[in-house]
């Protein structure tokens, strides 16, 4: 818990350089996000493909989309879970991080120093050991997050199943109902290829309790979809006389000394046919 209050932002006096004053873990060990670069990567043959169970959510069911002042968050059902880790990890929510229209490079994790346009996090908790996500969040092995890197490209109808509701959650505290859909559609191709490391929540209280899976391959959304995400939302309540746009809601990469990120793939990219000529 914070020493006092819970006000934090991505910009200004309550920005990330100040987080550790109220949230000591933010200045502590195993912090995320990180830069994924070749010096710290090690292939681990034991990293087998994950199975995504209960990810196909029925449209007959309603799921709550919330503007929490920091991101847009979709609540997920507890019977949606990952198989293939040491414990069962049940879903609790997903949310996104992004940049701004003038600098649309707002992913949290970077690859060889390069940002992607945005990043999706699907948050799960260890439901074998803990009754809910908030109990699990400060416990060892408590959380597992799937991270999807998002780049600008072609229109993505699956992501639009979230983005089409943004106008109803423009301001902090607003909530909308989203029909269930197949969350697996939000994941990239070849999910068997991923980076794995132990890290933290990327937002206060920055608990170092997260098993990270960052998929190697990005997904694409269109320029229009990205722009909608970057311009639709505010961090402030509807009646706030000083509205603040929800932009650049990503944390800078953190120091990652004397540790390794494990990969489920060997680092050599397969040559394209053009590259063989």
């Amino acid at each position: 818990a914070p020493v006092n209050g819970s006000k934090w932002t991505y910009f200004g006096p309550d920005g990330e350089n100040s987080w550790s004053k109220k949230y000591p873990s933010c200045g502590g060990l195993l912090q995320s996000p990180i830069d994924l670069h070749s010096d710290i990567l090690q292939y681990d043959a034991s990293l087998t493909p994950l199975e995504f169970q209960g990810y196909n959510l029925s449209a007959n069911k309603q799921f709550l989309l919330t503007n929490n002042g920091h991101s847009v968050k979709l609540n997920l059902p507890s019977d949606m879970h990952i198989q293939g880790l040491q414990s069962r990890y049940s879903a609790t929510q997903l949310h996104l991080h992004w940049g701004n229209p003038n600098d649309p490079h707002g992913s949290e994790h970077t690859v060889s120093g390069q940002h992607f346009a945005a990043e999706l996090h699907i948050v799960h908790y260890n439901s074998d050991l803990y009754p809910d996500a908030s109990t699990a969040s400060n416990k060892s092995e408590g959380l597992a997050v799937l991270a999807v890197l998002i780049e600008m490209g072609s229109f993505n109808p699956s992501y639009d199943k979230i983005f089409s509701h943004l106008q109803h959650v423009k301001y902090k505290g607003q909530e909308a109902f989203v029909p269930g859909f197949n969350i697996e559609e939000l994941l990239p191709e070849r999910t068997a290829e991923y980076y794995r490391y132990r890290g933290s929540l990327t937002t206060p209280p920055c608990n170092p309790t997260v098993l990270w899976t960052v998929f190697r391959n990005p997904v694409q959304i269109s320029q229009e979809q990205l722009l909608a995400l970057e311009t639709a939302l505010y961090c402030t309540h509807m009646d706030d006389p000083s509205p603040r746009e929800m932009i650049n809601n990503f944390r800078q990469v953190q120091k990652f000394d004397e540790r390794l990120v494990y990969t489920s793939f060997s680092q050599v990219q397969v040559c394209t046919a053009a590259g063989l000529s």
């Epitope: 029925s58 449209a59 007959n60 069911k61 059902p77 507890s78 106008q167 607003q174 909530e175 029909p179």
Partner: antibody, heavy 121, light 106 residues
Framework: EVQLVESGGGLVQPGGSLRLSCAAS????????IYWVRQAPGKGLEWVGY????????TYNQKFKGRATISVDKSKNTAYLQMNSLRAEDTAVYYC??????????????WGQGTLVTVSS | DIQMTQSPSSLSASVGDRVTITCRAS?????MHWYQQKPGKAPKPWIY???QLVSGVPSRFSGSGSGTDFTLTISSLQPEDFATYYC?????????FGQGTKVEIK
């Protein structure tokens, strides 16, 4: 035939609590959420909350958070609404209902007959 | 919360009359639903997705609108149409209903 049947209404003292039941039949119970909606005498409809019978996950109208608890017994195809610290303004007919997604829309296609709760000393 | 204001709150009309009920939302909504309720009975779904009639609802009923203003119209009122009609939005949490429009016999 798809049916929802509420029970458990009656006279309750102010400050007391109620536990209403909603028994479902005629469809695959875990495929649809169950909503509770109430209607005070001569007034409009007000949503209380809902439960996903597949996993017990609940979502409440903020107005009732902390005072209403919705639960489910999958083996009985029955959802429950418990409300505490009742006041006269909680006097209402309480309905359970099921939303269906049709085309691109949800709507409440099935309603129970309702059960009247009267809060009075 | 999105407030739903129906007007009029009640109206008297004769069989064969054209009747229009309006529902205004305090913020923009994607679509509107309408329910019919008769005394002592549960509401029945009547119109969904702004303009789609529920199976079995007579074609004299229609729905239209967008944004914040929606209407339910009965082109030629019949005896069985005397009831209370409620609009409802599902765009924002909490989902909310209008206060109802009671259609009475003149």
């Amino acid at each position: 035939e798809v049916q929802l049947v509420e029970s458990g209404g009656g006279l309750v003292q102010p400050g007391g609590s109620l536990r209403l039941s909603c028994a479902a039949s005629g469809y695959s119970y875990t495929d649809y959420n169950i909503y509770w909606v109430r209607q005070a005498p001569g007034k409009g409809l007000e949503w209380v909350g809902y439960i996903d019978p597949a996993n017990g996950d609940t979502t409440y109208n903020q107005k009732f958070k902390g005072r209403a608890t919705i639960s489910v017994d999958k083996s009985k195809n029955t959802a429950y609404l418990q409300m505490n610290s009742l006041r006269a303004e909680d006097t209402a007919v309480y309905y359970c209902s099921r939303p269906i997604y049709y085309g691109a829309y949800w709507y409440f296609d099935v309603w129970g007959q309702g059960t009247l709760v009267t809060v009075s000393s | 919360d999105i407030q739903m204001t129906q007007s009029p709150s009640s109206l008297s009309a004769s069989v064969g009359d054209r009747v229009t009920i309006t529902c205004r939302a305090s913020s923009s909504v994607t679509y509107m639903h309408w329910y019919q309720q008769k005394p002592g009975k549960a509401p029945k779904p009547w119109i969904y997705g702004t303009s789609q009639l529920v199976s079995g609802v007579p074609s004299r009923f229609s729905g239209s609108g967008s944004g914040t203003d929606f209407t339910l119209t009965i082109s030629s009122l019949q005896p069985e149409d005397f009831a209370t009609y409620y609009c409802q939005q599902w765009s924002s949490n909490p989902l909310t209903f209008g206060q109802g429009t009671k259609v009475e016999i003149k």
